[in-house]
């Protein structure tokens, strides 16, 4: 008689990342009997919800359920029906919703309330929707990449099974760039963290970690662009803004009311003698870089060392994984290779930004123009943020690894969030059961 395969004893979890520019749903899977092992949870699906982030539905909350339908139905298909009721669903909203809450707590609550009601209609074990803090976003991103890189495992290996892995157990720092905020998180070397707000203490798998983290609200790539435009239009002599961060020949009309909609531009707000202005690209990397640097206040620092805007930053230590928009933008620009030096990246950006808009449109015909138009700014912003904001140098640049996925799972905060909420990262090193790590059975 033929051997019948035993039913897979697996568990699933769902996390929705409600970001400022879009929402993504992630489905994770792991062997039920190995819940406390490190590195066993992996991503089986990502479903990107078409359309903007949930904060954009503030005036049309009744449409949120429809917006989420396709991805939630996809989850219903991927996860076996027998597992639906025990599969937890978590939604974490990030900086887009933090900004909406700053404007109106009532409106932010209304959006989350409708999200919760919509997600409760599915057969899963819905665990709630909430706005996570910037500190959590940084911490969970750090946990995710180090979990996937095997840094929490106490077993040393003579061979490497994951990219970037060195045989030491030194953790990677995490650099996360979103649309509305950016996070930097790492373990400093024997350095006291001078500001308590930036200090995290973890005990994971029997080891203590003192972690530095900070989230810069309004310094995600989209809000940084709004900030730059608001700053530059202040000194424009008329309703034409000649902008070095857009390709020569590029033109776009912007409503002043849209510019001042976000709390991120409040510090630059002024009464302008026009309702609209036109961006006219001139494509100059150096000038773009200079304009971006004006967003970083480096004139005061109440600590031994700061990033910008008076925020404490210890000396950088070790390797860093740069993910989310750090990766997407650099991947588009073909600059993610470990072999590309910082000088080469700068050189490539100079050439890219100087290319005429018509030429760019022809070269990248399949890319939506609204995204395509922003890569010059975004690439320049990434360089400015990493070099002047976080004090990476040409030498330490080689310690930055632009990471999209590790072992098939996306780098980002969602996996760390789920691991924490499902209690799958024990404080102490679990005792190995006789067969759980054996080479053969």
């Amino acid at each position: 008689t033929q051997n019948k395969a035993l039913p897979e004893n697996v568990k699933y979890g769902i996390v929705l990342d409600a970001g400022s520019s879009h929402t993504s749903l992630y489905i994770y899977k792991w062997p039920a009997e190995k819940e406390n092992d490190t590195g066993v949870v992996h991503q089986v699906e990502e479903c990107r919800v078409k359309g903007p982030g949930i904060s954009k539905f503030v005036q049309k909350v009744n449409e949120i359920g429809i917006y989420l339908t396709d991805c939630m139905e996809r989850a219903r298909e991927v996860i076996p029906r027998s597992q639906h009721q025990e599969t937890p669903v978590y939604l974490g909203a990030t900086a887009g919703m933090r900004l909406l809450r700053m404007e109106s707590e009532e409106l932010a609550d209304r959006v989350l309330d409708v999200v919760e009601r919509s997600l409760s209609n599915y057969p899963f074990d819905f665990q709630g929707a909430r706005i996570i803090t910037g500190q959590e976003e940084g911490a969970y991103g750090w946990i995710t990449i180090n979990y996937l890189l095997g840094k929490f495992s106490q077993k040393t290996r003579w061979f490497s099974i994951v990219p970037y892995e060195t045989n030491n157990q030194e953790t990677f720092g995490a650099l996360d760039l979103g649309g509305a905020s950016t996070q930097v998180t790492f373990v400093p070397q024997n350095q006291t963290i001078e500001s308590p707000d930036n200090a995290l203490q973890f005990r994971l798998y029997g080891k203590d970690y003192n972690v530095y983290t900070h989230s810069f609200l309004c310094y995600g790539k989209d809000q940084a662009l709004w900030q730059k435009l608001a700053k530059d239009i202040q000194v424009a002599s008329n309703e034409i803004l000649r902008d070095p961060c857009f390709h020569p020949g590029y033109k776009k009309v912007v409503n002043v009311s849209d510019l001042y909609k976000t709390p991120c531009t409040k510090r630059f707000e002024m009464t302008l003698p026009f309702q609209q202005f036109e961006i006219q690209g001139i494509g100059n990397y150096q000038q773009c870089h200079q304009s971006i640097l004006e967003l970083f206040n480096t004139s005061y620092c109440p600590y031994s060392q700061c990033a910008f805007n008076g925020i404490f930053l210890p000396p950088l230590q070790g390797d860093f994984g740069a993910f989310s928009a750090f990766y997407f933008v650099m991947k588009f620009l073909n600059l993610t290779s470990e072999k590309v030096s910082q000088e080469k990246v700068t050189e490539m950006m100079k050439k890219f930004c100087a290319q005429p808009w018509e030429e760019i449109k022809t070269s990248y015909a399949g890319v939506k123009e609204k995204y395509l138009s922003e890569y010059c700014f975004s690439g320049t912003y990434i360089l400015s943020l990493l070099l002047q904001g976080y004090h990476f140098t040409a030498d330490s640049w080689e310690h930055i690894h632009f990471i999209g996925k590790i072992q098939g799972s996306d780098a980002g905060w969602t996996l760390g969030y789920m691991l924490n909420l499902t209690n799958m990262i024990p404080a102490e090193q679990p005792l190995s059961t006789p067969l759980s790590h054996s080479t053969y059975v």
């Epitope: 400022s20 520019s21 919800v49 078409k50 359309g51 903007p52 954009k56 539905f57 449409e63 429809i66 917006y67 339908t69 396709d70 139905e73 996809r74 649309g179 989209d222 662009l225 709004w226 776009k252 912007v254 409503n255 849209d258 909609k261 976000t262 939506k368 609204k370």
Partner: nanobody, 122 residues
């Protein structure tokens, strides 16, 4: 920017039927969901029916079982089949994208068409 043109409205007696069409000037395949909305005189615009890119549909309680929404991505068109019409269905009907997509966070599909008038009376 996608332009939307609604058609198919008219006057009809209670219990009658109409089929509305919404033609888009650009591709709708990448749009999450398309919706039909209506606005009666002196009232707020309301969402009547929606269809996602995956083909899932959603209806306001007042039209469930009477209206059917469909989409043809190849023709960049969305339809609303309206049966068993009632006088309270009288309104200007519009179609639009649910959510739309963004440039610097601005809603690209907040450009409403002219709409098409539906009048139900005996």
């Amino acid at each position: 920017q996608v332009q939307l043109v609604e058609s198919g409205g008219g006057s009809v007696q209670p219990g009658g039927s109409l089929k509305l069409s919404c033609a888009a000037s650009g591709s709708i395949s990448s749009i999450n969901a398309m919706g039909w909305y209506r606005q009666a005189p002196g009232k707020q615009r309301e969402l009547v029916a929606a269809i996602t890119s995956g083909g899932y549909t959603n209806y306001a309680d007042s039209v469930k079982g009477r209206f059917t929404i469909s989409r043809d991505n190849a023709k960049n068109t969305v339809y609303l089949q309206m049966n068993s019409l009632k006088p309270e269905d009288t309104a200007v009907y519009y179609c639009n994208a649910i959510g739309g997509s963004t440039w610097f966070g601005e809603d690209e599909y907040d450009n409403w068409g002219q709409g098409t008038q539906v009048t139900v009376s005996s």
